[in-house]
């Protein structure tokens, strides 16, 4: 028997520095977690103790903090090289700055293979990107070889900016011939490493003949065997065992997100490359693990540029940006409109001639808007200003919901109106009218939504049985502020871009902004 240790991360999302327990900015260092310096300590400890170790990343290193905003992926290449990753799969967020924003900072600089079998380049891009990412890679580990085959969510064109010259194929269809190729090269130990979410990971384990282990990402899935060490609730045991269609037991793993855990899986293979046993658990990277001093020193060196960036002007406002709780928790506020407009703008993807865009709607809990921005400071808006408005380090995500769920959400928005509570929704691409004289749960008297399958966008009444795409904060997607109906009834959820980054990009693009209060939210006469 031959034993392999797989160390894995996924959805790190630019958490290069240690974070608080909820993966936001580290405040009390003695209670902070993760970060590449701490990760390196643990990885090196395992490499010294065990003979056959692979360090893998299942995508979405890009996007999530000011590190990515400033360094645009150069930080990912630099620190992944320093940690000596063995391979990485492309995630959807690796395309956030377009293909060029992937090639220049990451593909050209990585000292490790970057993989995806189901992304096919065409046209002029085919030769430009040739060899910079691969469908698979064979890696020598000790006296054996291990094949790693990559995959990426086929929803990427809707979630990011891969352009028109990359085709995202069905994962299973694309993986099978690559795995077959590895078999003909006498590679009998094969890991599928990819970024399509836990459901797809399980399908790959079930359907792709010859895959021995699946290491996944995208869905931020936390798996654990035994008593979990922090706040995350396990979605299943680690590893999650799937019985393949040809009768094999295939371990599937994922390691939550944000570099909080290091996935640790031990696999035992027989001489024919069959998995005999698999066991392990994610390792919580808490403060009991010291940060490596040399990586930490490097982080501090790179940090300097971030501090300078946060005070630079992104753009100007010529109006007061009202982000006060007195406004945003009671009525339409222009800060809410600005943020929602930025959220929609960030998700413009012309992927189908029938649609002007794939999504037109935004909802945003008023309680998530934490500060106004005064225009009387020469109109200047900085990252620092935006960090006061959106201090929680969340993301603006894409969900699919039925009209009936949206109606419930808007009822919840005003079910206890008047108490300055955070659930009051700010909107974009939606016209809502409330009648507060009616009883809670029956206060939405009009709800019109902007069409997407149209050449001239216009507002139509919400249809209860129709499925709509909506951009919203991850906080709401996870049922925050009492929006349990969103969490329970959502049909699909894809993580998006860092909230501040979305707004800062929009302001930089617009240069001068002047958001108005324009009648998106109304109260029927006599009730307000």
């Amino acid at each position: 028997a031959w034993e392999l240790t797989i160390l894995h991360t996924n959805d790190v999302h630019s958490r290069l520095e240690q974070t608080s327990e909820d993966s936001s900015k580290c405040v009390n260092a003695s209670r902070c977690m993760g970060g590449v310096a701490r990760l390196f300590t643990k990885v090196q400890q395992i490499r010294r103790a065990e003979p056959n170790v692979l360090l893998l990343d299942a995508g979405d290193q890009y996007q999530g903090t000011i590190w990515f905003t400033v360094y645009k992926g150069a930080e990912v290449a630099h620190f992944m090289n320093a940690l000596r990753y063995d391979a990485m799969a492309l995630g959807n967020h690796e395309f956030d700055n377009g293909v060029e924003g992937l090639i220049e900072p990451l593909l050209k600089e990585a000292k490790f293979p970057i993989l995806s079998a189901n992304i096919k380049a065409k046209g002029p891009l085919a030769s430009q990107i040739s060899g910079l990412y691969l469908p698979y890679k064979v890696l020598p580990v000790g006296d054996e070889v291990v094949g790693i085959v990559g995959y990426t969510s086929k929803e990427t064109p809707f979630l990011s900016n891969p352009g028109t010259n990359l085709v995202f194929e069905d994962e299973i269809t694309a993986l099978q011939p690559e795995v077959d190729k590895l078999k003909t090269l006498n590679v009998n130990k094969i890991i599928a490493l990819g970024h399509s979410g836990f459901e797809m990971d399980k399908l790959i384990a079930q359907k792709v003949r010859g895959v021995d282990v699946v290491v996944g990402g995208h869905s931020n899935t936390f798996l654990y065997t035994g008593n979990p060490p922090s706040k995350e609730v396990p979605a299943g045991k680690y590893p999650f065992i799937v019985t393949s269609d040809d009768g094999r037991k295939v371990p599937v793993v994922q390691a939550y997100a944000f570099g909080k855990y290091l996935g640790y899986l031990k696999i035992e293979f027989d001489e024919r490359g069959n998995v005999i046993s698999s066991h392990g658990n994610p390792i919580l990277l808490n403060s009991s693990i010291p940060e490596d001093p040399s990586i930490k020193a490097d982080i501090n060196k790179w940090r300097i540029k971030l501090d300078n960036y946060s005070t630079q002007e992104l753009g100007k406002t010529i109006v007061y940006l009202d982000g006060s709780s007195q406004s945003c928790r009671f009525r339409e506020c222009n800060m809410g409109n600005l943020i929602c407009d930025a959220m929609i703008n960030n998700n413009l993807r012309h992927t189908d001639e029938m649609f002007w865009n794939h999504v037109s709607m935004c909802i945003l809990n008023g309680g998530g808007i934490r500060s106004p921005i005064d225009e009387r400071n020469n109109g200047t808006i900085t990252w620092e200003n935006l960090a006061a408005v959106l201090p929680f380090g969340g993301t603006f995500d894409l969900v699919q919901l039925k009209g009936s769920t949206l109606k419930k959400a808007f009822e919840h928005s005003v079910h206890r109106y008047g108490q300055s509570t955070g659930e009051f929704l700010q909107v974009g691409g939606i016209h809502v009218v409330y009648d507060l004289s009616r009883k809670p749960g029956d206060r939405v008297v009009k709800l019109d939504v902007l069409c997407t399958k149209c050449r001239v966008p216009s507002y139509d009444p919400l249809k209860m049985d129709e499925v709509y795409k909506v951009i919203l904060p991850n906080f709401l997607a996870n049922g925050g502020d009492g929006f349990q109906m969103i969490k329970d009834e959502l049909l699909r959820h894809d993580s998006g871009d860092q909230d501040i980054n979305v707004v800062s990009t929009y302001i930089s693009k617009m240069k001068v902004i002047y958001p108005a209060v324009e009648g998106r939210i109304k109260f029927s006469t006599g009730s307000h």
């Epitope: 000596r84 090639i103 990107i129 020598p140």
Partner: antibody, heavy 117, light 106 residues
Framework: QVQLQQPGAELVKPGASVKLSCKAS????????MHWVKQRPGQGLEWIGE????????NYNEKFKSKATLTVDKSSSTAFMQLSSLTSEDSAVYYC??????????WGQGTSVTVSS | DIKMTQSPSSMYASLGERVTITCKAS??????LSWFQQKPGKSPKTLIY???IWVDGVPSRFSGSGSGQDYSLTISSLEYEDMGIYYC????????FGGGTKLEIK
């Protein structure tokens, strides 16, 4: 297939300059960094520097900073290295090599530079 | 600057023999080490990178190993076309070649 074509030889006078070329084909020139390496007769290999053809960014071996200047012409997929104030110490074979995963994969055939009056 | 010390500087070996060449770095180079083969009058050919990963088309008799500061290239069974000069290269911090090992057939 990937090819890096370099002229066979250059004869130059002491104190003069020479501009060596390396024409890339079989791949997109701007997608990979290009290295330059020196080899004196009967000696080992010495790294001079590297250039990112798409943005012109360079990294140099400290020893060659005032000797070598790396440039590219994207339109002809050609990398250049200018060597200045030549002395007999600069007589060597100079190779270009494509960078992948941080190291070198494909090498040119090398240009032999002879510095002689 | 990282210094690479390669040994031996030259060696003779018989056909079919197992041959090992070593390279020592002046500091930990994180396995960022390549091996090259150069034949007289020819340009170098890349054999191995990242300490142990073969370049496509390189015969399986060549293998690389090592970590930290110490690395080696092994030819499991020497063949006539293997004679030449072998160089290591660290690429952890910029680039430094080893001094070379001249391998000749006995």
């Amino acid at each position: 297939q990937v090819q890096l074509q370099q002229p066979g030889a250059e004869l130059v006078k002491p104190g003069a300059s020479v501009k060596l070329s390396c024409k890339a084909s079989g791949y997109t020139f701007t997608s990979y960094w290009m290295h330059w390496v020196k080899q004196r007769p009967g000696q080992g290999l010495e790294w001079i520097g590297e250039i990112n053809p798409s943005i012109g960014r360079t990294n140099y071996n400290e020893k060659f900073k005032s000797k070598a200047t790396l440039t590219v012409d994207k339109s002809s997929s050609t990398a250049f290295m200018q060597l200045s104030s030549l002395t007999s110490e600069d007589s060597a074979v100079y190779y270009c090599a494509r960078r992948v995963y941080g190291t070198m994969d494909y090498w040119g055939q090398g240009t032999s530079v002879t510095v002689s009056s | 600057d990282i210094k690479m010390t390669q040994s031996p500087s030259s060696m003779y070996a018989s056909l079919g023999e197992r041959v090992t060449i070593t390279c020592k770095a002046s500091q930990d180079i994180n396995s960022y080490l390549s091996w090259f083969q150069q034949k007289p009058g020819k340009s170098p050919k890349t054999l191995i990178y990242r300490a142990n990963i073969w370049v496509d088309g390189v015969p399986s008799r060549f293998s690389g190993s090592g970590s930290g500061q110490d690395y080696s290239l092994t030819i499991s069974s020497l063949e006539y076309e293997d004679m030449g000069i072998y160089y290591c290269l660290q690429y952890d911090e910029l680039y430094t070649f080893g001094g070379g090992t001249k391998l000749e057939i006995k």
